[in-house]
């Protein structure tokens, strides 16, 4: 059998493999050692007994999408049946005091590979036995602690494979410089040690994406905006646009990145080297926001052009400048960079909102029949922008962290936006008051610290200072 017979359902073309050469990977036309690594089809009854106590699940994730030329990293995590885990020596043990369907286990080991390798590893003088090899016959790498690594992972994509010895979690990074753009499939087959051979325990596949567009995400936030995810924002308040470039392998770390913004409100193009920008819309309506990100990414250097062919006989005059085999436009950049672009587009709606709220006065309320321990305080509040429909107050400790009381109520406010909010305070002391005015689209907040003095029991009337 060949690797592609074992790892995939379809035979990949040599043409495809040639156009997607992965550094350090091997062609899946290579032979697979079926004696050492048996192959079971999906639905084979032997899968049921491939692991003691249940089935092992392999979880494959990647940091896709990857900008072409960058590295993409794949991580495989093995999820063992309930109550099983890998110990420091790479053995699979039962967790203490963990009860599964079979109850508590007397034997601490699910698989005691250390014991097996110590007493049954007949090796030759080189420390390399005939079974410590990968499916293609390549020997296991002998780095420190390799004996505690009891799983063989075979990664397969684009007609090529990569073998790795590991524990219950492995990570593989692939450079995408030669990968065809678009979605591609990564398949992983996992084997465990079994005497002097290996047994398949899990198979998993995942789609990853290679792109020539910089993956760009933009978060939009605005003070007083009630819902940051509905792409509706307020007029006359700055919106903060923050650009996140998905670049987990830091491929663009040394690139100069330019951000070109068009806010769709006839304010022209705005070019910045900062990933954060503020913009204020001064009109209501719907606007088309466009961002183009440009980065000079590291690129392969094209080979120098071949020397011009020798003319068959000497020519008396020099040819025109255009005959120069290395015309000016062909001189590669010193660092062979390629301009890469990313795009983001959004339609945002701008509406009226409450822009600002201020407490202009606080007054102790005169109480004819004083309560046992409470004080009433009036807050005179003004606002700018649209007219609020509700008011909320949150009363908390002086650090503004521990909420003691929160009350919301509808309000009817005139065009002048002047309102009085009355709230009760239990006992004397210093309080933090957060006062919020809201409507459908906005929520404006102001805070103040107030001191409520001790009550004078002899006096039933008290005025605020």
């Amino acid at each position: 059998k060949r690797f592609h017979d074992v790892l995939g359902n379809e035979r990949p073309s040599a043409y495809m493999r040639e156009h997607n050469q992965l550094n350090g990977w091997s062609s899946d036309e290579n032979d697979w050692n079926e004696k050492l690594y048996p192959v079971w089809k999906r639905g084979d009854m032997r899968w049921k007994n491939s692991w003691k106590g249940g089935r092992v699940q392999a979880v494959l994730t990647s940091d896709s999408p990857a900008l072409v030329g960058s590295n993409i990293t794949f991580v495989v995590n093995l999820v063992f049946p309930r109550c099983q885990k890998e110990d420091a020596n790479g053995n699979i043990v039962y967790e203490k005091n963990c009860r599964n369907e079979a109850g508590l286990s007397a034997d601490p080991y699910v698989y005691n590979w250390t014991a097996w390798s110590e007493d049954s590893d007949g090796e030759n003088g080189t420390g390399q036995s005939h079974h410590n090899v990968f499916p293609d016959g390549k020997p296991f790498p002998h780095h420190p602690g390799w004996r505690r690594w009891n799983f063989v992972y075979v990664f397969h994509t684009l007609g090529q494979y990569f073998q790795k010895l590991g524990r219950c979690s492995v990570r593989v990074s692939v450079n995408t410089a030669n990968v065809t753009l678009g979605p591609q499939l990564m398949e992983v087959t996992v084997y465990r040690r079994h005497g002097r051979a290996y047994v398949p325990i899990a198979q998993v596949k995942d789609v990853y994406v290679v792109t020539d567009q910089i993956p760009v995400f933009v978060t939009m936030s605005q003070k007083n905006d009630r819902n940051s995810s509905d792409e509706t924002f307020l007029k006359d308040l700055p919106i903060t646009f923050d650009v996140l470039i998905h670049d987990p392998s830091h491929f663009l770390n040394y690139s100069t990145i330019n951000y070109k913004w068009s806010f769709g409100d006839n304010t022209g193009l705005f070019v910045s080297i900062n990933h954060t920008v503020n913009h204020t819309y001064v009109l209501n309506g719907t606007f088309s926001l466009n961002l183009t990100v440009k980065a000079a990414a590291p690129g392969p250097c094209p080979p120098p052009p071949p020397p011009p062919p020798r003319p068959p006989k000497p020519t008396p005059s020099l040819g025109p400048a255009g005959d120069n085999p290395l015309g000016l436009s062909e001189i590669p950049d010193e660092n062979c960079q390629i301009n890469r672009y990313g795009h983001f587009q959004a339609t945002i709606t701008i509406v009226e909102g409450i822009l600002e709220v201020n407490i202009i006065q606080t007054t102790d309320v005169l109480m004819l029949v004083p309560g046992p321990d409470s004080s009433l305080i009036d807050f005179v509040v003004t606002c700018q922008g649209s007219i609020p429909t509700e008011v909320c107050t949150i009363i908390s400790d002086p650090t503004c962290e521990i909420t003691q009381n929160a009350v919301c109520s509808p309000v009817d406010v005139d065009e002048m936006c002047l309102l009085t909010v009355r709230r009760a305070f239990n006992g004397s002391g210093t309080y933090c008051v957060n006062l919020t005015l809201g409507d459908d689209t906005s929520l404006a907040l102001t805070s103040t610290l107030i001191s409520v003095p001790d009550r004078d029991p002899a006096s039933s009337l008290r005025m605020a200072n």
């Epitope: 990949p12 073309s13 043409y15 495809m16 040639e18 156009h19 753009l181 678009g182 020539d212």
Partner: antibody, heavy 125, light 107 residues
Framework: QVQLQQPGAELVKPGASVKLSCKAS????????MHWVKQRPGQGLEWIGE????????NYNEKFKTKATLTVDRSSSTAYMQLSSLTSEDSAVYYC??????????????????WGQGTSVTVSS | DIQMTQSPASLSVSVGETVTITCRAS??????LAWYQQKQGKSPQLLVY???NLADGVPSRFSGSGSGTQYSLKINSLQSEDFGSYYC?????????FGGGTKLEIK
Amino acid sequence: QVQLQQPGAELVKPGASVKLSCKASGYTFTSYWMHWVKQRPGQGLEWIGEINSSNGRTNYNEKFKTKATLTVDRSSSTAYMQLSSLTSEDSAVYYCARLGYYSGSPYPYYAMDCWGQGTSVTVSS
Amino acid sequence: DIQMTQSPASLSVSVGETVTITCRASENIYSNLAWYQQKQGKSPQLLVYAATNLADGVPSRFSGSGSGTQYSLKINSLQSEDFGSYYCQHFWNTPPTFGGGTKLEIK
């Protein structure tokens, strides 16, 4: 839209060389391989070779290895094919064509999805 | 190199008829095949990729089929604009060779 522009015709003398150009627009030049194809009058299509527009890697039809040299200029998004030691056998229309890719399961598929108009090369003294 | 044998070399048909052009590869190419149309004095245009998938903008009267070494291109209810030459090309390995072509003429 995606376009490959080639000059209409070249008249060259036997034994000389000619450098044919193919200017790409409407797509990211470095993301695609470029192919070159020969068609003699009244004949079929003959594959010459291909070049990776990003790193300049080439593959040639054995028959054209000593005849054709493929290069690219990334800064102008232009692919070139130089034909040397020309004879009447080289009189033909030469096309550049972009290698398109299509997502398949589990592997991508390829085809020449965009062609230039072709350059007619006449070798005559 | 893989040899691509196209048949027939030429075909004379009337508008409205259905035609089938075949392409045989000298070895299994596992559906890595494209079909092109070339009109007189023009450059070729992609019709079908991966043996059965129509390229963008290609009318549905065209269809590709086949597997292994045998592939065909079928044109239902032939239109006047369909006359010209048709070529198959494999993408199994390098070089990706073309078939010899089929010339479709109006009867």
